[in-house]
């Protein structure tokens, strides 16, 4: 279930897990279904807050991903301590009206009090029924 991602910060992310997805194989996001994501990262700062930002490029058009709870402290225990590893588990209910696409790039960024905590880009996602 471990998937390959491109780091877009300073290699804070240790691993990303998505049930049913493997390595660099296409990862299917099903419309109207829950999409589970787990990420392990090492905090690069002490922070009281952790805010998640998810953007998707669908056929080259960048969009904010709807229906996201931005407070990462709802799904991991805050505050975060620099140097410690944390496990984020999040389930996103994919909208039924999400556009179908074979070319989806997802960028997940976690922001702390002093800037980027972690950042990953998944380049092999697809949105299907």
């Amino acid at each position: 279930d471990q998937v390959d991602v491109k780091d877009c910060a300073n290699h804070e992310i240790k691993k990303v897990l998505v049930p049913g997805c493997h390595g660099s194989e296409p990862c299917i996001i099903h419309r109207g279904k829950p999409f589970q994501l787990e990420a392990v990262f090492e905090a690069n700062q002490n922070t009281k807050t952790a805010k998640i930002e998810i953007k998707a490029s669908i056929d080259g058009l960048e969009v904010d991903v709807p229906g996201i709870d931005p407070n990462a402290c709802h799904y991991m225990k805050c505050p975060l301590v620099k140097g410690q590893q944390y496990d984020i588990k999040y389930t996103w209910n994919v909208p039924k009206i999400a556009p179908k696409s074979e070319n989806v790039v997802v960028t997940v960024k976690v922001m702390g009090d002093d800037g980027v905590l972690a950042c990953a880009i998944a380049t092999h996602a697809k949105i299907r029924d």
Epitope: K48, N71, C73, H74, C78
Partner: antibody, heavy 118, light 106 residues
Framework: EVQLVESGGGLIQPGGSLRLSCAGS????????MAWVRQAPGKGLEWVST???????FYADSVKGRFTISGDNSKNTLYLQMGSLRAEDTAVYYC????????????WGQGTMVTVSS | SYELTQPLSVSVALGQTARITCGGN??????VHWYQQKPGLAPVLVIY???NRPSGIPARFSGSSSGNTATLTISSAQAGDEADYYC?????????FGGGTKLTVL
């Protein structure tokens, strides 16, 4: 002073609709994480809905498809549009602000009573 | 769905220590918050993130959490502490409250 004031409660027949308002002062409602929480007479607290500054909304299963949470930046007000009301929706409805440095509701309104009865 | 279990009532003698528990599966891995509610009034946050007190809350109020139990402790209980107390956690994007505990100060 930072505070929230609810209004819009009242007596409504089953199947009817009602819109609750929550006016904020001392902070901007629409740039904060905001929630509605209700309390049936003699019962405990029950979460109803949450809205985040980016516009994402979440609902308890008991109200999903019937209630809609929203905010108006110009009025600095949070709303709860309630439809297809049932007797079990009878409760005091509170709006509350979530402090993101605490993940807890640090500011609450005084509550507004909604009674669903024929 | 995630559930939190609290005792319906707890009694404490004036000036003694009251402990109110909140049980949940692996609750120690979550941030636990506590609210005090007096009759006819809105809830008031008394402890956030397991053990932190908001400004204005007396030092008599403290909290802890580990394993499957979180505990709100009120030392040297006063008559004014008589109220309902609720624990709260986030289960991903869902707010979960405990059923509430009525604290009686004898």
């Amino acid at each position: 002073e930072v505070q929230l004031v609810e209004s819009g409660g009242g007596l409504i027949q089953p199947g009817g609709s009602l819109r609750l308002s929550c006016a904020g002062s001392g902070f901007t409602v629409t740039t904060n994480y905001m929630a509605w929480v209700r309390q049936a007479p003699g019962k405990g607290l029950e979460w109803v809905s949450t809205i985040y500054s980016a516009g994402s909304t979440f609902y308890a299963d008991s109200v999903k498809g019937r209630f809609t949470i929203s905010g108006d930046n110009s009025k600095n007000t949070l709303y709860l549009q309630m439809g297809s009301l049932r007797a079990e929706d009878t409760a005091v409805y509170y709006c509350a602000r979530e402090n993101p440095a605490q993940d807890a509701f640090d500011i609450w309104g005084q509550g507004t009573m909604v009674t669903v009865s024929s | 769905s995630y559930e939190l279990t609290q005792p319906l009532s707890v009694s404490v003698a004036l000036g003694q220590t009251a402990r109110i528990t909140c049980g949940g599966n692996n609750i120690g891995s979550k941030n636990v918050h506590w609210y005090q509610q007096k009759p006819g009034l809105a809830p008031v946050l008394v402890i956030y993130r397991d053990s932190n007190r908001p400004s204005g809350i007396p030092a008599r109020f403290s909290g802890s959490s580990s394993g499957n139990t979180a505990t709100l402790t009120i030392s040297s209980a006063q008559a004014g502490d008589e109220a309902d107390y609720y624990c709260h956690v986030w289960d991903t994007s869902t707010v979960v409250f405990g059923g509430g505990t009525k604290l009686t100060v004898l």
